[in-house]
Interface confidence: low
């Protein structure tokens, strides 16, 4: 399982996700933030 800061934040913070160019606040973890150092 993903255990890094990126993944923890995605699970807990309710990040916005992309869907067809429309922003939806659906609290689904996304891969948008793949950790950049």
């Amino acid at each position: 399982a993903c255990d890094t800061a990126t993944c923890v934040t995605h699970r807990l913070a309710g990040l916005l996700s992309r869907s067809g160019g429309v922003v939806k606040n659906n609290f689904v973890p996304t891969n948008v933030g793949s950790k950049a150092f």
Epitope: C2, T4, L15, L16, S17, V23, N31, V32, A36
Partner: antibody, heavy 122, light 107 residues
Amino acid sequence: EVQLVESGGGLVQPGGSLRLSCAASGFTFSNYWISWVRQAPGKGLEWVAEIRSESDASATHYAEAVKGRFTISRDNAKNSLYLQMNSLRAEDTAVYYCSSYFDYGLAIQNYWGQGTLVTVSS
Amino acid sequence: EIVLTQSPATLSLSPGERATLSCKASKRVTTYVSWYQQKPGQAPRLLIYGASNRYLGIPARFSGSGSGTDFTLTISSLEPEDFAVYYCSQSYNYPYTFGQGTKLEIK
């Protein structure tokens, strides 16, 4: 203007200690996760340590190679990051970069400093 | 530790050509992969995150693809300033790891 400026590098003998600093400006430092990443001369990149944001309790993680010898910390009031390096070895010789990261859902922000050189040699 | 293997080690191409760089992970990392460009004497520069998302200000000629264990960075038409070393990294598990780099040189 966003800036990360590392300092504290230099020549140190094996077994010695050094404290690196990274001064941040131009962004909300406390919201960012920060990593130290190093690069030995002529070699590739190696992650060293990470400290999470204030809201993530400033939790820390370390590479096995430095665990127990290096300590990462932050002072959000001073917009500063630190890396305390003890029991230094020749293989710790590298340019040390600090890199900040923030994910705001739609995209991310990622900033790097210019690096500071640490040389461990007798 | 997740090992990232980049290929080729060196890629010799001319401006205007298409560059395809590969990064293979020893374990599945979903899409938690980033790509960086580094020029001599400079800090790395983030190009792609989340396997396929272009970072702020990165030209459209840079694109990333892949998921699971196989990832690709493509530069559709090389500009003179693109010749540099490229690294992939993963942030799926600690420790974060980087590939060994691909040097993109002018033919």
